[in-house]
C-alpha cells in the first residue's frame, strides 16, 4: 500500500508585488491524522506561513475548504505579496501526536517576487564646472525584483557610452538596488542638455522609468569680455563700454577699475539670453578725459559665480584733449544694457 | 458506498477471531479503517485505527490483543486472547477521526464470547 | 487518556423542543476542535452528524448544530422532529493518534 505523497505542482511562482499568490498542495491520503503546516524556507530557522490545526494568520487562506470531508487539497492563497515574501515555501504533513511529528515534506515552491523599480533619481556633481571637462552623473533605482534590469544613459537623446553598473546585492535577495555612474564632457552649448536614466524591467511592461539632471544645474560658462571706445558724445567725454558675452549662470559682478583703482561696481541684472541658455551684459563707463594729464588704462573686471576674476583692459589715450584747468577728478558714469541714462 | 463487517461469530475465552470489513464503491488506500465496538446495552468503545503498515494504533486497552491490517478494499482486525468482556458488535467506519470523522459505518458484526 | 463526559444521559423532549447536549473533555481536545457528534437508533450503526466541533456532515439536516472549542462542546437540535429520538455520542481526540474516546451518551427520549 502506497504511503501519503505531498504534491507540490509548482516548481515556482512569480507574482507581482500587492497581487496573492497561490501556492499549490495536494496529498494523496488522509493516513495519517494530523494538519498540514506551510513554512517559508527549510531547517531550524524556517518561518510558519501557515497551520492547519491552529492559529491566526491574517494574509493566508485555503483555496479549499480545509474542513471538508475527504479535503486532500491544502492550496494556500498569500495576500498582498511583498518582496519580503519571496522563498521557496514548504507544505509539510504532521502526524499527530504529543507533540505533531512532521512526516512528509513537499519538494518546495520557488515564490519570487516581481516589483517595480522605483523612479530613478539622477545626482550630478556637487560643484559646477566647465565647458571642456568631464563630469561625472550617478543614477540610482532601488526595490526591484528580479535582478535583471537594463540601464541606459542618453545626453539628449543620444545614447551614451562611457558609465559603469552595479546592481546590488550580487547574491539572492528579497529586492536588489542598481546604481550607474556616466561620465559627461561637457560644451559651451550644454546649458539647455538634458542628461537622461532609462531604466527597464520586466514589471514595466515596456514602459521604462527615467530620470533626468539639467546640465544647467552643473555647467558654468565663463564669459568673454570685450572693452571698446564709444566715439565722443561730447567734448572731453569719452564713453568706453564692456561687453560680457557668452556666460551662465547669471550671477556676474563687474568692476570698473580706472588706473588700477576702483571706479564702479555693479552686478549684472537686466541680462539678454541668447537660444543656447547663456547670457549677454554690457556695462559702460562716461569718461571726462578733461580730468586726466595722462594716458587712462580703463579696466573691465568681472567675477562670474564666485570664481576668480578675469578682465580686459583699454588703454584711454587722452593727450590729444585740452586740459581744462582746475579740474584732478574724472567725472563718469556707468551704464548697463547700453541703456543712455541722460 | 459502504461498508461491510463479517467474521462474527461465538468465540471460546482464550480463542482468536479475524473479522474482516470489504468497501464496495470506494477505495480504502487512502483513508484510515477505524474499528469501534458495543458491548450489549452499553455505549461505543473506540478500539483503534488500521492506516497503513506503518500507521496502525489501538487504545491503550487494545494494544496487544488487536492487531490489524488493510489492503485497498478490506480492512482485517485480529482478536486475540479474547475475554467474556469482549463480547459486543463491532463496527468498521472509515475515517481516522480529527478532520476524517468515521463516516460511513458498516452495519456491525457480533462477537460473543463464551464457553 | 482523555475522558469525555456527556451530560444529561438522558433527556425528553417533545416534537419542536430545543434541545442542548453537552460534552466535556478532561483536557482540551487535539487542535481544540477535535469533537465529533454521533447519532445511533437502537439496532443501527452510529451515523456522523458533526465534526471538527461545528462543521455539519454531508446530508445532515441544518437543524443539528455543534459549537464550542477546548473542553466544552454543545449539540443543538433546533427544533425536534420525531426521527431524532435517539442516543447521541460525543468523540473526543486527544494529543495522541490512538487517543480516541466516546462520551457515555445521551439518550433523547420522547416526553
Known amino acids: 500500500e502506497e504511503e501519503l505523497q505531498v504534491i507540490q505542482p509548482d516548481k515556482s511562482v512569480s507574482v507581482a508585488a500587492g497581487e496573492s499568490a497561490i501556492l499549490h498542495c495536494t496529498v494523496t491520503s488522509l493516513i495519517p491524522v494530523g494538519p498540514i503546516q506551510w513554512f517559508r524556507g527549510a531547517g531550524p530557522a524556517r518561518e510558519l506561513i501557515y497551520n492547519q490545526k491552529e492559529g491566526h494568520f491574517p494574509r493566508v487562506t485555503t483555496v479549499s475548504e480545509s474542513t471538508k470531508r475527504e479535503n486532500m487539497d491544502f492550496s494556500i492563497s498569500i495576500s498582498n505579496i511583498t518582496p519580503a515574501d519571496a522563498g521557496t515555501y514548504y507544505c509539510v504533513k504532521f502526524r499527530k501526536g504529543s507533540p505533531d511529528t512532521e512526516f512528509k515534506s513537499g519538494a518546495g515552491t520557488e515564490l519570487s517576487v516581481r516589483a517595480k523599480p522605483s523612479a530613478p533619481v539622477v545626482s550630478g556633481p556637487a560643484a559646477r564646472a566647465t565647458p571642456q571637462h568631464t563630469v561625472s552623473f550617478t543614477c540610482e533605482s532601488h526595490g526591484f525584483s528580479p535582478r535583471d534590469i537594463t540601464l541606459k544613459w542618453f545626453k539628449n537623446g543620444n545614447e551614451l557610452s562611457d558609465f559603469q553598473t552595479n546592481v546590488d546585492p550580487v547574491g539572492e535577495s528579497v529586492s536588489y538596488s542598481i546604481h550607474s555612474t556616466a561620465k559627461v564632457v561637457l560644451t559651451r552649448e550644454d546649458v539647455h542638455s538634458q542628461v537622461i536614466c532609462e531604466v527597464a524591467h520586466v514589471t514595466l511592461q515596456g514602459d521604462p522609468l527615467r530620470g533626468t539632471a539639467n546640465l544647467s544645474e552643473t555647467i558654468r560658462v565663463p564669459p568673454t569680455l570685450e572693452v571698446t571706445q564709444q566715439p565722443v558724445r561730447a567734448e572731453n567725454q569719452v564713453n568706453v563700454t564692456c561687453q560680457v558675452r557668452k556666460f551662465y549662470p547669471q550671477r556676474l559682478q563687474l568692476t570698473w577699475l580706472e588706473n588700477g583703482n576702483v571706479s564702479r561696481t555693479e552686478t549684472a541684472s537686466t541680462v539678454t539670453e541668447n537660444k543656447d541658455g547663456t547670457y549677454n551684459w554690457m556695462s559702460w563707463l562716461l569718461v571726462n578725459v578733461s580730468a586726466h594729464r595722462d594716458d587712462v588704462k580703463l579696466t573691465c573686471q568681472v567675477e562670474h559665480d564666485g570664481q576668480p576674476a578675469v578682465s580686459k583692459s583699454h588703454d584711454l589715450k587722452v593727450s590729444a584733449h585740452p586740459k581744462e584747468q582746475g579740474s584732478n577728478t574724472a567725472a563718469e558714469n556707468t551704464g548697463s544694457n547700453e541703456r543712455n541714462i541722460y | 458506498r459502504q461498508l461491510v463487517e463479517s467474521g462474527g461469530g461465538l468465540v471460546q475465552p482464550g480463542g482468536s477471531l479475524r473479522l474482516s470489513c470489504t468497501a464496495s464503491?470506494?477505495?480504502?488506500?487512502?483513508?484510515?479503517i477505524s474499528w469501534v465496538r458495543q458491548a450489549p446495552g452499553k455505549g461505543l468503545e473506540y478500539i483503534g485505527t488500521i492506516g497503513t503498515g506503518v500507521i496502525t494504533y489501538f487504545a491503550s486497552w487494545a494494544k496487544g490483543r488487536f492487531t490489524g491490517s488493510k489492503t485497498s478494499s478490506t480492512a482485517y482486525m485480529e482478536l486475540s486472547s479474547l475475554r467474556s468482556e469482549d463480547t459486543a458488535v463491532y463496527f468498521c467506519?472509515?475515517?481516522?477521526?480529527?478532520?476524517?470523522?468515521?463516516?460511513?459505518w458498516g452495519q456491525g458484526t457480533l462477537v460473543t464470547v463464551s464457553s | 487518556d482523555i475522558e469525555m463526559t456527556q451530560s444529561p444521559s438522558s433527556v425528553s423532549a417533545s416534537v419542536g423542543d430545543r434541545v442542548t447536549l453537552t460534552c466535556q473533555a478532561s483536557?482540551?481536545?487535539?487542535?481544540?476542535?477535535?469533537l465529533a457528534w454521533y447519532q445511533q437508533k437502537p439496532g443501527q450503526a452510529p451515523k456522523l452528524l458533526i465534526y471538527?466541533?461545528?462543521t455539519l456532515a454531508t446530508g445532515v439536516p441544518s437543524r443539528f448544530s455543534g459549537s464550542g472549542s477546548g473542553t466544552d462542546f454543545t449539540l443543538t437540535i433546533s427544533s425536534l422532529q420525531p426521527e431524532d429520538f435517539a442516543t447521541y455520542y460525543c468523540?473526543?481526540?486527544?494529543?495522541?493518534?490512538?487517543?480516541?474516546?466516546f462520551g457515555g451518551g445521551t439518550k433523547v427520549e420522547i416526553k
Open positions: 467506519a472509515r475515517g481516522s477521526a480529527w478532520n476524517d470523522p468515521f463516516d460511513p
Open positions: 471538527l466541533a461545528s
Open positions: 464503491g470506494f477505495s480504502l488506500s487512502s483513508h484510515g
Open positions: 483536557q482540551s481536545v487535539y487542535g481544540n476542535n477535535d
Open positions: 468523540l473526543g481526540g486527544g494529543d495522541d493518534e490512538a487517543d480516541n474516546v
